[in-house]
Interface confidence: low
């Protein structure tokens, strides 16, 4: 696991305890809540992510709305189940034994049950859209700029194959952000999008999980993007599975 | 430490009711699910059902539904098995045992001693 | 529900040998798998939970492992006091179902 070695710190998860005990005394670093090695040359995934920030004192969350399109992340925190490569588990449960299957990025995809609710499958998020406004500026910014921009921020702050970000719209004050993975595209190494989407989120309201990086200064042209309001879809690879009650 | 401990031995004729009791110390009790499984003599473990002791509801198994009851006094941290309409074949050991709820899951990490009930006419 | 079948039922072996009892799910359940050891006239212990996680206190030449419908127990060297019946369980999803029990016997 890639660490920095002078002082031994995780640069991509400033959520780990870091130690010299690697093999031949190289910084290894784990998650909180979890303990689980993280590799610090790429992103950690969420559920490893979520679980270290609920071993944390709590930081209240702002809810967002439902999207009749799309799962939107509206449950809140929860202390997530997470398999041992750091995914989520199909089926999450509450300290209630109240139970629901989540897609992979963790957001909840069927009306809640109780401990004999079952989830077959971990169901793929294949298509995450990041909705921001930003705060009034002088002028529009120029479309390309921006798309330039953004994708530049995903690839290198990220670490996400620019294959990988499949538009970026923009009508004043709206920008829209569209990461696509399919699992046939995903090789081996790839930052999945449902992590970098995370990473983004948390950069964007001022919660970095980079180590010593600072926060997010965006600038298109040399004109800051500040972001006043985030609301993110994700679309699943097989419809989610909620009763008619909760679609009207 | 964490124990459970269950009320003594019962001999009951057909057709009546049997209550056990399983009293929880060491732990706080609301935190954890409590489960029922009896074992018959010389055979394998069987589950009966739980009670979620944070919200007080139980859930029972599909064969004893109608029959068993679960319920549970918070004040005194005491779990209890009701079986009714006994037959022959109900003659078993009672356990009661600790579960994870939530996330945890649902392994039996603490057990009581065990109740016998001999169900004979 | 979900059977979980166990193999074999009994075993004969010795103190020092590595023993492996194997339970299988009738259907996928991740790896919401517990294993017990039984000793007669005694409760169940607890010595392995979510297939593969000693249970505290618990000898470390007991391991499990396996995911799906595929778990193992094994007994690295065995000592005399291993010597009872071992049950695994799903605990996946109601009803929790028990496998018949294999009983370990000294040769």
């Known amino acids: 696991h890639t660490a920095a070695q002078d002082n031994c710190t995780c640069p991509t998860n400033k959520m780990t305890v870091c130690s010299p005990d690697g093999p031949g005394g190289r910084c290894q670093c784990r998650a909180l809540g979890s303990g689980m090695a993280v590799d610090c040359s790429t992103l950690t995934s969420k559920c490893l992510l979520l679980k270290a920030r609920m071993s944390a004192p709590k930081n209240a969350r702002t809810l967002v709305r439902p999207s009749e399109h799309a799962l939107v992340d509206n449950d809140g925190l929860y202390d997530p189940d997470c398999d041992p490569e750091g995914r989520f588990k199909a089926r999450q449960c509450n300290q209630t034994s109240v139970c629901w299957c989540v897609n992979s990025v963790g957001v909840r995809r069927t009306d809640k049950g109780d401990l004999s609710l079952r989830c077959d499958e971990l169901v793929r998020t294949h298509h995450i859209l990041i909705d921001l406004r930003h705060r009034p500026t002088a002028g529009a910014f120029n479309h390309s700029d921006l798309d330039a921009e953004l994708r530049r921020l995903f690839r290198e702050r990220y670490r996400l194959h620019p294959k990988f970000v499949a538009a970026v719209h923009y009508e004043q004050p709206t920008i829209q952000i569209e990461l696509r993975q399919n699992t046939s595209q995903k090789a081996a190494g790839d930052v999945d999008i449902g992590d970098a989407a995370y990473y983004f989120e948390r950069d964007i309201k001022g919660e970095s999980l980079f180590q010593g990086r600072g926060g997010l200064d965006l600038r298109v042209r040399g004109e800051p993007l500040q972001v006043e309001r985030t609301l993110i879809y994700y679309l699943d690879e097989i419809p989610p599975k909620f009763s008619m009650k909760r679609l009207t | 430490q964490v124990q459970l401990v269950q009320s003594g031995a019962e001999v009951k004729k057909p057709g009546a009711s049997v209550k056990v009791s399983c009293k929880a110390s060491?732990?706080?009790?609301?935190?954890?699910?409590m489960q029922w499984v009896r074992q018959a003599p010389g055979q394998g473990l069987e589950w009966m059902g739980w009670?979620?002791?944070?919200?007080?509801?139980?859930k029972y198994a599909e064969d004893f539904k109608g029959r068993v009851t679960i319920s549970a006094d918070t004040s005194t941290s005491t779990a209890y098995l009701q079986l009714s309409s006994l037959k022959s074949e109900d003659t078993a050991v009672y356990y009661c045992?600790?579960?994870?709820?939530?996330?945890?899951?649902?392994?039996?990490?603490?057990w009581g001693q065990g109740t016998l009930v001999t169900v004979s006419s | 529900d979900i059977q979980m079948t166990q193999s074999p039922s009994s075993l004969s072996a010795s103190v020092g040998d590595r023993v492996t009892i194997t339970c299988k799910a009738s259907?996928?359940?991740?790896?919401?798998v517990a294993w017990y050891q039984q000793k007669p006239g005694k409760a169940p212990k607890l010595l392995i939970y979510?297939?593969?996680h000693r249970y505290t206190g618990v000898p470390s030449r007991f391991s499990g492992s396996g995911s799906g419908t595929d778990f193992t127990l094994t007994i690295s060297s065995l000592q005399p006091e291993d010597f009872a019946v071992y049950y695994c369980?799903?605990?996946?999803?109601?009803?929790?179902?028990f496998g018949q029990g294999t009983k370990l016997e000294i040769k």
């Open positions: 060491g732990y706080t009790f609301t935190t954890a699910g």
């Open positions: 045992a600790r579960s994870g709820f939530g996330s945890h899951y649902w392994y039996f990490d603490v």
């Open positions: 009670i979620n002791t944070h919200s007080g509801v139980p």
């Open positions: 979510s297939a593969s």
């Open positions: 259907q996928d359940v991740s790896t919401a």
């Open positions: 369980q799903q605990h996946y999803i109601t009803p929790l179902t």
